[in-house]
């Protein structure tokens, strides 16, 4: 089981939208996959994916989850608030027949205040 996550760094303006993507690859077929997003070490949500369907569509404040078979999990934050700033990690686990866990690399999300005098460039950096 492996998890690839992106982007590494995401900088967005307050009130806009942020999208975090996670790709889950498993060598053998699974009946039920448990996925999880954490922010700063605390769990935001941890639904199951069964038959290509998510058991939950929400994930933390203003967070929406989607699953695109066979392997893409997306967390969309909309609208983004200053409180969304932090370190996000995507996890995946297969619990049957034996536990197998994997985690992605951190996505650091920076949220700029909605202040027109601060005209910073948006940054989105994906791994390799």
């Amino acid at each position: 089981l492996s998890v690839q996550q992106g982007p590494n760094l995401l900088q967005v303006r307050q009130g806009s939208q942020a999208t975090l993507v996670c790709q889950v690859d498993q060598a053998t077929a699974w009946e039920r996959l448990r996925v999880k997003w954490t922010k700063d070490g605390a769990i935001l949500c941890q639904p199951y994916i069964t038959n290509g369907s998510l058991s939950l569509g929400v994930c933390g404040p203003q967070g929406r989850l989607s699953w695109q078979a066979p392997s893409h999990l997306t967390l969309q934050l909309d609208p983004v608030s200053l409180n969304h700033s932090g370190a996000y990690v995507c996890w995946a686990a297969v619990e049957i027949p034996e536990l197998e866990e994997a985690e992605g690399n951190i996505t650091r999300l920076f949220v700029d205040p909605d202040d027109p005098t601060q005209n910073r460039n948006r940054i989105a950096s994906f791994p390799g």
Partner: antibody, heavy 118, light 107 residues
Amino acid sequence: EVQLQQSGPELVKPGTLVNISCKASGYTFTSYDINWVKQRPGQGLEWIGWIYPGDGSTNYNEKFKGKATLTADKSSSTAYMQLSSLTSENSAVYFCARRGLRYYFDYWGQGTTLTVSS
Amino acid sequence: DIQMTQTTSSLSASLGDRVTISCRASQDIRNYLNWYQQKPDGTVKLLIYYTSRLHSGVPSRFSGSGSGTDYSLTISNLEQEDIATYFCQQVNTLPWTFGGGTKLEIK
């Protein structure tokens, strides 16, 4: 501070049912699994099952299927375990416990003593 | 189901001693082994997860080791507050199972 506060001791008659509650505080209730564990006097611990309050999904130890029913109320941040068709074998201390970031129980309730006696 | 065996059900030691509590699984559990402490008043706390990772707030005198089917919990310098019963738990395979416990007492 994370806390799991369980309901008080129960003395019930054989053949009846009981509901044990576990009120969570200090964290987002819908984000973490709540597990239930049985401890008979002077014995080890037995895992009963878990509920994920976020979507209501459950997973039971086969041994407790048909005996235990796990539910959760998001509005009150409370998990419940109903035990039915009670016998003396069900007399035990029952714990609720939160599963942490990974596969371990990082916070436990204080336990609820159930006595089944006629 | 995987059976977890703690062969020593009770153990006596002196304050300051190094104490080792063992746990054996009926099959390989690939380090998915946790340790819990239950105080005489019934309070249960997580000590160690994934064989050797110390849970936050747990004193560093506690440590864990092992692999395959054999695991151990070591208390390097026994203190009065360590008097409790210790349980191992495997989470490699459902249903998750616990050992029978090792009760630690003061000599």
